[in-house]
C-alpha cells in the first residue's frame, strides 16, 4: 500500500512542464495525475527529470495502465523506456514499426539489453514473421541481430526479407543458422544472373550443400578464401581438386596459407596427392598414389 500524501496547495500539475523538475518525489506522486501524464508523454523527454523522478512517472503510468501500456503511450516513452523491465514489456502489444524505431533509438549505441530483446520478441511475435522492413530496422540498430536468433526463429523469416540482409549482419552466424538462411537466400536471389547472384549469395554460403558449390564452380565466380573457409566442411569434402580450383580461381593460391585449418585441412586429406600436386602449391597430406580410397559412408549404406 502506497503512503498517500495530499498535494500541497497550488502545486497541482496542470500540465507536464519544466516546473516539475523542482518537485520532490512525494510531490510528483501526489500532484501529477497519471491520466494527464499519458496525454502529454511527448513532453517528458524534453524535460531533464532525474532518474528518481522518472521512477515516479513510470509508477504513475503503471497505476493508470495495470495491464500494460497502450501503444499511444509506448511510442512516446523516450528515456522512460530505460526504466521498463522485461516483465513490463511483456504486457505490451507493439504493432507499429515507428514505435519500435523510437524505442530502439533510445538504446542506440548500447548493447542489446534484456528490455530491447523482449521488445523485439514481442514485436516480431505480434507480426507473425520477420518481414523485410522489420529486419531492415533491427539490423540497422543491431548488426548481429539475425545471428542472435535460433534456427527455429529464423525459419519464420520469409525469403523476401533476405534482401534486407547485409554481409556484416551474418558475421556471427553459426553453421546451424546459415543452414536455415541459405535456402531462403537461394530462393530470394534465384532470378539474378551469375555474377550478381554470387555477390548476393556469398555471405550465406556457409549453409550451402555440395551440389550448389559444384554448380558455382562452373560459373567462374572466384570465391575469396575468407568465404571458402566459412563453408561447411561436409560440403567441401566431396569437391574435387579441379572443382576447388575453378571455385577459387586466382584465390586458389591462398589454400597454402590455410592448409592446417578446417575445412582446407580435412579436404586435403580426402584428395589424391598427385591431384593436389597439379595445383603447384606444395600442399601435402593427400592420399599417396596407389592407395585405394574406400567410401565408408557408401559401404554403411549398402550394408
Amino acid at each position: 500500500e502506497v503512503e498517500k500524501t495530499a498535494c500541497p496547495s497550488g502545486k497541482k500539475a496542470r500540465e507536464i512542464d519544466e516546473s516539475l523538475i523542482f518537485y520532490k518525489k512525494w510531490e510528483l506522486e501526489a500532484c501529477v495525475d497519471a491520466a494527464l501524464l499519458a496525454t502529454q508523454m511527448d513532453r517528458v523527454n524534453a524535460i531533464p527529470f532525474t532518474y528518481e523522478q522518472l521512477d515516479v512517472l513510470k509508477h504513475k503510468l503503471d497505476e493508470l495502465y495495470p495491464q500494460g501500456y497502450p501503444e499511444s503511450v509506448i511510442q512516446h516513452l523516450g528515456y522512460l523506456f530505460l526504466k521498463m523491465s522485461p516483465e513490463d514489456i511483456r504486457k505490451w502489444n507493439v504493432t507499429s514499426l515507428e514505435t519500435l524505431k523510437a524505442l530502439l533509438e533510445v538504446n542506440k549505441g548500447h548493447e542489446m539489453s534484456p528490455q530491447v530483446a523482449t521488445l523485439i520478441d514481442r514485436f516480431v511475435k505480434g507480426r507473425g514473421q520477420l518481414d523485410k522492413d522489420t529486419l531492415d530496422t533491427l539490423t540497422a540498430f543491431y548488426p548481429g541481430y539475425l545471428c542472435s536468433l535460433s534456427p527455429e526463429e529464423l525459419s519464420s523469416v520469409p525469403p523476401s526479407s533476405i534482401w534486407a540482409v547485409r554481409p556484416q549482419d551474418l558475421d556471427t552466424c553459426d553453421p546451424r543458422q546459415l543452414d536455415v538462411l541459405y535456402p531462403k537466400a537461394r530462393l530470394a536471389f534465384q532470378n539474378m544472373n551469375g555474377s550478381e547472384y554470387f555477390v548476393k549469395i556469398q555471405s550465406f554460403l556457409g549453409g550451402a550443400p555440395t551440389e550448389d558449390l559444384k554448380a558455382l564452380s562452373q560459373q567462374n565466380v572466384s570465391m575469396d578464401l575468407a568465404t571458402f573457409m566459412k563453408l561447411r566442411t561436409d560440403a567441401v569434402l566431396p569437391l574435387t581438386v579441379a572443382e576447388v580450383q575453378k571455385l577459387l580461381g586466382p584465390h586458389v593460391e591462398g589454400l597454402k596459407a590455410e592448409e592446417r585449418h578446417r575445412p582446407v585441412r580435412d579436404w586435403i586429406l580426402r584428395q589424391r596427392q598427385d591431384d593436389l600436386d597439379t595445383l603447384g602449391l606444395g600442399l601435402q597430406g593427400g592420399i599417396p598414389n596407389g592407395y585405394l580410397v574406400l567410401d565408408l559412408s557408401m559401404q554403411e549404406a549398402l550394408s
Epitope: V2, K4, R14, A34, L36, T39, P66
Partner: antibody, heavy 119, light 108 residues
Framework: EVQLLESGGGLVQPGGSLRLSCAAS????????MSWVRQAPGKGLEWVSN????????NYADSVKGRFTISRDNSKNTLYLQMNSLRAEDTAVYYC????????????WGQGTLVTVSS | EIVLTQSPGTLSLSPGERATLSCRAS???????LAWYQQKPGQAPRLLIY???SRATGIPDRFSGSGSGTDFTLTISRLEPEDFAVYYC?????????FGQGTKVEIK
C-alpha cells in the same frame, strides 16, 4: 459482472455537508481510476472529480474545488465524495463511474443518488 | 478548460432515418480522448463510442463515430425506436474532463 452502487444522497440545507459512497464489485477496484459525474434536474452531464487507484491523485471541476473531496478505501472497494458548503446549484443526481484508461471513457456507471440542497 | 459544443440541440427524426450529431471542441482534441454516451430518461449514461470511432462493448454497428481535431461526429445509420435518447460527447484530454451540453434525438 461490474456493479456500482451509490448511496448517501438526500435532502440537505445550503451550507450543509453530505458524504456519498459508491460500493464497487465485479472488477479490480484497486487498479482502476474512479469518477463522480453529476446531472442537475433537466440538465446535462457535468464531470465532478476523479481519483487514481494507487496514489489517490485527485482532480476536480472548478465549480466544486475546495468544497468537495473525493477519496477511496481500496480495502473496502468503496469510493467516496465528501461534499461540504453545499449550494442550491449542487442539487443533482450524482453518478459514480469507472474510468477505463484503455478505452479512455467512463465504461460503467451506477444508477445515481439524488442530492437535494434546499432550505 | 476545453469547451465542447454539440449541435443541433434537438434532432427530430423518424425510425429508419439517419441521424448525424456534431460535437465541436474549443481546442484540438486528440481523437483517442473523445467519447460519446447515450442516456435514456431515468437511466444512467452508457458509453457508446471511445477514441472518437471505436464502438464500446455491445454497441450495435449502426452507431459510428468519426472526426479529428476540433470536429467530431456521431452517426446513427438507421434509427431504431430504442435509439431515441440524449447523446453527449466528452473529452478526457485535459482536466476537467468536460461534457458537451447534449443533443436530444426525438421521434418526429
Amino acid at each position: 459482472e461490474v456493479q456500482l452502487l451509490e448511496s448517501g444522497g438526500g435532502l440537505v440545507q445550503p451550507g450543509g455537508s453530505l458524504r456519498l459512497s459508491c460500493a464497487a464489485s465485479g472488477f479490480t477496484f484497486t487498479q482502476t481510476y474512479m469518477s463522480w459525474v453529476r446531472q442537475a434536474p433537466g440538465k446535462g452531464l457535468e464531470w465532478v472529480s476523479n481519483i487514481s487507484p494507487t496514489y489517490s491523485t485527485t482532480n476536480y471541476a472548478d465549480s466544486v474545488k475546495g468544497r468537495f473531496t473525493i477519496s477511496r478505501d481500496n480495502s473496502k472497494n468503496t469510493l467516496y465524495l465528501q461534499m461540504n458548503s453545499l449550494r442550491a446549484e449542487d442539487t443533482a443526481v450524482y453518478y459514480c463511474a469507472r474510468y477505463n484508461a484503455y478505452q479512455i471513457g467512463l465504461d460503467y456507471w451506477g444508477q445515481g443518488t439524488l442530492v437535494t440542497v434546499s432550505s | 478548460e476545453i469547451v465542447l459544443t454539440q449541435s443541433p440541440g434537438t434532432l427530430s427524426l423518424s425510425p429508419g432515418e439517419r441521424a448525424t450529431l456534431s460535437c465541436r471542441a474549443s481546442q484540438s482534441v486528440s481523437s483517442s480522448y473523445l467519447a460519446w454516451y447515450q442516456q435514456k430518461p431515468g437511466q444512467a449514461p452508457r458509453l457508446l463510442i471511445y477514441g472518437a470511432s471505436s464502438r464500446a462493448t455491445g454497441i450495435p454497428d449502426r452507431f459510428s463515430g468519426s472526426g479529428s481535431g476540433t470536429d467530431f461526429t456521431l452517426t446513427i445509420s438507421r434509427l431504431e425506436p430504442e435509439d431515441f435518447a440524449v447523446y453527449y460527447c466528452q473529452q478526457a484530454l485535459g482536466y476537467p474532463h468536460t461534457f458537451g451540453q447534449g443533443t436530444k434525438v426525438e421521434i418526429k
